[in-house]
Amino acid sequence: KKVVLGKKGDTVELTCTASQKKSIQFHWKNSNQIKILGNQGSFLTKGPSKLNDRADSRRSLWDQGNFPLIIKNLKIEDSDTYICEVEDQKEEVQLLVFGLTANSDTHLLQGQSLTLTLESPPGSSPSVQCRSPRGKNIQGGKTLSVSQLELQDSGTWTCTVLQNQKKVEFKIDIVVLAFQKASSIVYKKEGEQVEFSFPLAFTVEKLTGSGELWWQAERASSSKSWITFDLKNKEVSVKRVTQDPKLQMGKKLPLHLTLPQALPQYAGSGNLTLALEAKTGKLHQEVNLVVMRATQLQKNLTCEVWGPTSPKLMLSLKLENKEAKVSKREKAVWVLNPEAGMWQCLLSDSGQVLLESNIKVLPTWSTPVQP
């Protein structure tokens, strides 16, 4: 008996061939001997089977002695033995229909679990192997689970169902809902405008939800909500914003926040959360703000940074085109009695400058100028 594997929702074509290469009488029946489809001369007839309006043939092949049974929009319960009767012969084909579905939704939040469930006909014993977009293989029986989904798991999962040495391949598109970056850091000189961007790592037709940015300033004892907003069909509307600082928010995606000026009291860490409609859980992105200030007070030139800096960052003070006068893995450096000229305060990571502030030191009879 020939075995054919089909996919739920797909179309399958079961073949039946006569030795005579011409249109002759044929019938397709199921295992209960109920007529599904056949011919009446040159015309198609259909029996009272449950397949009635989903069964078809290919009339153009009848003259060649081929009498296929085409079943569209396959259902698991279409799994059966189908018998083609032609020329006093019977050809039997066993059709096994499988379905593979993702647990509730194919749009999942980062960190959530993905469960793939195989629907199979009674009496079958298939094995399933799935390959994720990043090449990770998982194997299982009726269910396969992947915990802690990552951004790289977004894309097409290819799953192969194996039964009777035959295989059928399913492709499932999984979208991991996350921000493009888990964390970002912005370095700014005091007084500069700050732009925070929160690009999403996915695109959907309609995006609705609500969000909030909580901020923990380095100098503050507790965190506070800086802004709350709504998202309706990719349109952003601000619900509530603090008076200090008075953030501004872009009306379109990607989510975009503007802080009018970087000040030491704002330096710190924020957590933007986004709750999407019909989803349990929230998307998170951490954002950090480091602020630099260079000042000259009497005979002391000081450079300071506020905010979450890594211990390996180097803070330096140097006269332009000269070697650094002072370099320390600290958040403040100073030079006493600095020479006149353009001084640079640099925050760097392994030689790469992250933030730079210039201050002009005038001869002692002048007052300092800060560009």
Partner: antibody
Framework: QVQLVQSGAEVKKPGASVKVSCKAS????????MHWVRQAPGQGLEWMGW????????GYAQRFQGRVTMTRDTSTSTVYMELSSLRSEDTAVYYC??????????????????WGQGTLVTVSS | DIQMTQSPSSLSASVGDRVTITCRAS??????LAWYQQKPGKAPKLLIY???TLQSGVPSRFSGSGSGTDFTLTISSLQPEDFATYYC?????????FGQGTKVEIK
């Protein structure tokens, strides 16, 4: 219940083309073949061709080969019959028709149980 | 193509009469034959299929018989609503072909 609703009457000049539509409802559109039959004034019935709305396959009567095209739009459950290079003898009522089912649920494509109301196409200079 | 020949081409009868129309195929068509009734300005209506099976909703005064090449439609007792044109059609091979019609008129 099965309903086949055709487009309205048309007047065409010789050499022109006409496209008649037939909108089906009350059954699974892609499950059954659609046929076109015409009837010239005071004359008998003449079969023109068939279309399988599921696959888009077609078959035309020899005398209409090259002049008739049958198409479908599954999203609106509509079949179209276009006849080109019209001549005065193409003046007729054009019917769409589909096969019938008996009380046991057997379907016979070759017997036309359900018919559209007909579309009169007049070809005149 | 299979030729279908109906006779007579027209007949006059009275209400209550028994009417018989014949249809001959140019080659054997088993029992794959249908009969239709058509009234002026209307689409044909299927009366009988498979030579003798009455279509659902059709009055029992209509009956069909025959096999191979010769077929008959009989109206046992003609009613006023039966005055119409009747067509036979073979459903055995492509193209499906119709008889030229038999017009049943009031005497």
């Amino acid at each position: 219940q099965v309903q086949l609703v055709q487009s309205g009457a048309e007047v065409k000049k010789p050499g022109a083309s006409v496209k008649v539509s037939c909108k089906a409802s009350g059954y699974t559109f892609t499950g059954y073949y659609m046929h076109w039959v015409r009837q010239a004034p005071g004359q008998g019935l003449e079969w023109m061709g068939w279309m399988n709305p599921n696959s888009g396959d077609t078959g035309y009567a020899q005398r209409f080969q090259g002049r008739v095209t049958m198409t479908r739009d599954t999203s609106t459950s509509t079949v179209y019959m276009e006849l080109s290079s019209l001549r005065s003898e193409d003046t007729a009522v054009y019917y769409c028709a589909t096969g019938g089912s008996d009380s046991s649920g057997y379907y016979y494509e070759g017997y036309f149980q359900h018919w559209g109301q007909g579309t009169l196409v007049t070809v005149s200079s | 193509d299979i030729q279908m020949t109906q006779s007579p081409s027209s007949l006059s009868a009275s209400v209550g009469d028994r009417v018989t129309i014949t249809c001959r195929a140019s080659q054997t068509i088993s029992n794959w034959l249908a009969w239709y009734q058509q009234k002026p300005g209307k689409a044909p209506k299927l009366l009988i299929y498979a030579a003798s099976t009455l279509q659902s909703g059709v009055p029992s005064r209509f009956s069909g018989s025959g096999s191979g090449t010769d077929f008959t439609l009989t109206i046992s007792s003609l009613q006023p609503e039966d005055f119409a044109t009747y067509y036979c059609q073979q459903a055995n091979s492509f193209p499906p072909t119709f008889g030229q019609g038999t017009k049943v008129e009031i005497k």
